[in-house]
Interface confidence: medium
């Protein structure tokens, strides 16, 4: 349910973002998001996902790359790049769902 707090099996993920309680979090899947805001350097956030699984399937753009995975600490060593510097054949933002 996209509104209620999530229930169900959770996976432990590396958490590295301004909103992390600690070094790990638990969610329905793990995420890595690389975002470049106008006039700023890209910032990479690692954490947990509970909603909007469809974002995992989005192709990288020059502003955002959204990566998801489903196993224990699977987002720990993932590094993303944005579309402007990445050949189409090497895009890691794929999601099996």
């Amino acid at each position: 349910d996209p509104v209620k707090p999530s229930r169900g099996p959770l996976v432990t993920c590396t958490c590295e973002s301004p909103h992390c309680k600690g070094p790990t979090c638990r969610g329905a899947w793990c995420t890595v998001v690389l975002v470049r805001e106008e006039g700023r350097h890209p910032q990479e956030h690692r954490g947990c996902g509970n909603l909007h699984r469809e974002l995992c399937r989005g192709r990288p753009t020059e502003f955002v790359n959204h990566y998801c995975c489903d196993s224990h600490l699977c987002n720990h060593n993932v590094s993303l790049v944005l579309e402007a510097t990445q050949p189409p054949s090497e895009q890691p933002g794929t999601d099996g769902q």
Epitope: V3, H19, N50, L51
Partner: antibody, heavy 121, light 110 residues
């Protein structure tokens, strides 16, 4: 910058209808669940309704269930609250609000300025 | 009966530590995270604490949240006159399928 601008408030007679709108800007509207919260004059906050990012899930407070309908038009970046069979106790400032982050169960993180609805004969 | 109960008022002197309680049940505070909002007169509410004890950026570290069982607390250390406001706790309620706010606490400076 997240901006939520409510409109459509005013004075209405008991039993009549009113539709509130909330124009959203500064973020990808279609990614976020949205709430309506109201506050009667001199009283506390009362949650009214919530709608999921895609409109597939809606929940209502018991006090408005069957009378109010929350909806959204993601192509217009607009949230709505259709209020029917209005009562004097529906008199309040109605706040449109966005959740803080994508995750389910996210708290309300951003609030509009509020629009006043007065139900009076 | 209110779902989340707060004391109607609280007060403190500048520099003091002030605490506001919020009492609920297993279907809300006991099973879901607690959020705190404050509201200055004539303004929209503002998120102060979320996820029981997390502060949004821009909120001073003088504000802290905690939870134990079906009760939650908001603590304000080094209380200031600018902290005078109405404070509300909130949480999702699984039984009601609703987001519920506390009754609110008016915090004043002595």
């Amino acid at each position: 910058e997240v901006q939520l601008v409510g409109s459509g408030g005013g004075v209405v007679q008991p039993g009549r209808s009113l539709r509130l709108s909330c124009a959203a800007s500064g973020f990808t509207f279609s990614n976020y669940a949205m709430h309506w919260v109201r506050q009667a004059p001199g009283k506390g906050l009362e949650w009214v309704a919530v709608i999921s990012y895609d409109g597939s899930n809606k929940y209502y407070a018991d006090s408005v269930k069957g009378r109010f309908t929350i909806s959204r038009d993601n192509s217009k970046n607009t949230l709505y609250l259709q209020m029917n069979s209005l009562r004097a106790e529906d008199t309040a400032v109605y706040y449109c609000a966005r959740v803080r982050y994508y995750g389910s169960g996210s708290p309300i993180g951003y609030w509009g300025q509020g629009t006043l609805v007065t139900v009076s004969s | 009966l209110p779902v989340l109960t707060q004391p109607p008022s609280a007060s403190g002197t500048p520099g003091q530590r002030v605490t506001i309680s919020c009492s609920g049940s297993s279907s809300n505070i006991g099973g879901n995270t607690v959020n705190w909002y404050h509201q200055l007169p004539g303004s929209a509410p503002k998120l102060l604490i979320y996820g029981d004890d997390l502060r949004p950026s821009g909120v001073p570290d003088r504000f802290s949240g905690s939870k134990s069982g079906t009760s939650a607390s908001l603590a304000i250390s080094r209380f200031q006159s600018g902290d005078e406001a109405d404070y509300y706790c909130a949480a999702w309620d699984d039984s009601l399928n609703a987001y519920v706010f506390g009754t609110g606490t008016k915090l004043t400076v002595l």
